[in-house]
Interface confidence: low
């Protein structure tokens, strides 16, 4: 299988790019910074720094639409009817595909077409308040290149990794654009 040198994509037979990223978000005024983490028990929450459990595979599944999968939990990021995020083992188009909007400030918003809500790490109370406002906290994500060495496979789902600090290296995450800066890596995920 030949790898393209166009950028940090993992290529399989269908030629779909998979980007390895951490998704950084922060609360008001830059407080409560966190990285989206999909845990082995299916809980989606914040990691205060990059960790093996916040490493995500982001795959274009349609035009401007992506699926997001935790590398170590092998769970897809999915949304329930109330907007609550959960990591699921089985991908479904209706709950686990998100429209990717690249904002002028470099942050991305991921919206569920079905639920009409953005991916967010907000609490249920915050999501309730959002219905009468406009901006849902912890819903703007800055894609960051991984700066953390992956842990061995036999640690998958077991460890809450140490925190790592890293410079904010980002890219636009344009599903059909060319990005650079990460060597192509094979992964068992998204093999279908």
């Amino acid at each position: 299988l030949a790898f393209s040198d166009a950028g940090p994509h993992v290529h399989y037979g269908w030629g779909d790019p998979i980007r390895l990223r951490h998704l950084y978000t922060s609360g008001p005024h830059g407080l409560s910074s966190c990285f989206l983490r999909i845990r082995a028990d299916g809980v989606v929450d914040c990691a205060r720094g990059q960790s093996a459990h916040s490493l995500l595979e982001i795959k274009a599944v349609a035009l401007r639409t992506v699926a997001i999968k935790g590398v170590h939990s092998v769970r897809y990021l999915c949304m329930g009817a109330d907007g609550k995020m959960q990591g699921l083992l089985q991908y479904s188009e209706e709950d686990c595909a998100f429209e990717e909007e690249i904002r002028p400030d470099g942050y991305n918003v991921y919206r569920s077409e079905k639920h009409r809500l953005p991916v967010s790490l907000s609490s249920a109370k915050q999501r309730q308040l959002y219905k009468n406002r406009g901006f849902l906290p912890l819903s703007h994500f800055l894609p960051m290149l991984p700066m953390v060495p992956e842990e061995p496979e036999d640690l998958r789902g077991h460890l809450e990794s140490d925190m790592f600090s890293s410079p904010l290296e980002t890219d636009s995450m344009d599903p059909f654009g060319l990005v650079t800066g990460l060597e192509a890596v094979r992964s068992p995920s998204f093999e279908k």
């Epitope: 699921l88 089985q90 479904s92 093999e191």
Partner: antibody
Framework: EVQLLETGGGLVQPGGSLRLSCAAS????????MSWVRQAPGKGLEWVSA????????YYADSVKGRFTISRDNSKNTLYLQMNSLRAEDTAVYYC????????????WGQGTLVTVSS | QAGLTQPASVSGSPGQSITISCTGT?????????VSWYQQHPGKAPKLMIY???NRPSGVSDRFSGSKSGNTASLTISGLQTEDEADYYC??????????FGGGTQLTVL
Amino acid sequence: EVQLLETGGGLVQPGGSLRLSCAASGFTFSSYAMSWVRQAPGKGLEWVSAISGSGGSTYYADSVKGRFTISRDNSKNTLYLQMNSLRAEDTAVYYCAKDVWQELLFDYWGQGTLVTVSS
Amino acid sequence: QAGLTQPASVSGSPGQSITISCTGTSSDVGGYNYVSWYQQHPGKAPKLMIYDVSNRPSGVSDRFSGSKSGNTASLTISGLQTEDEADYYCSSYTRSSTLVFGGGTQLTVL
């Protein structure tokens, strides 16, 4: 109370076709993935196929890929398994199983329907 | 996808503890913490007893416990009771996004 009732089993010749149905009640059918799991007489369980809540995503065991098709009609709360090119080794009790969501993890099972492939 | 390997049968006396093993590969049991155990009485549908290696659904007795080491998962039943006599199947999520079961273990309570 969650109930799953499989129908459509029976005797069919090798190479023939059969369609199994599973009528579901007691839960919001469209919110859950569903699977078919089979068990040959006196043998163990074998996962056959799964389908997401909307029916947009399907999964198959290698042993049935290309021959079986899973589908669902959420308006009728019914799960289906279309079985073509049947073989003797497909003889089994076929169970319909409700997923906890989309986990390939089953919290409710039907009582099963027997499919016999024989000439 | 080959099935997971379980002993064909195990037995124990009431009150004793027994352990059933389930061996797979790094592509299933060893790769993920998504091992489940089902109990099946003759002529009945299976019942979920353990999920995600060691978690019990509500309503399942705490006499049932699960663990995993490497490519092998284990189900332990302590304080054996006559109603525990049944077939037990392990299952695991696999690298190819499918599910694989073990061949089953027949538990006899002497």
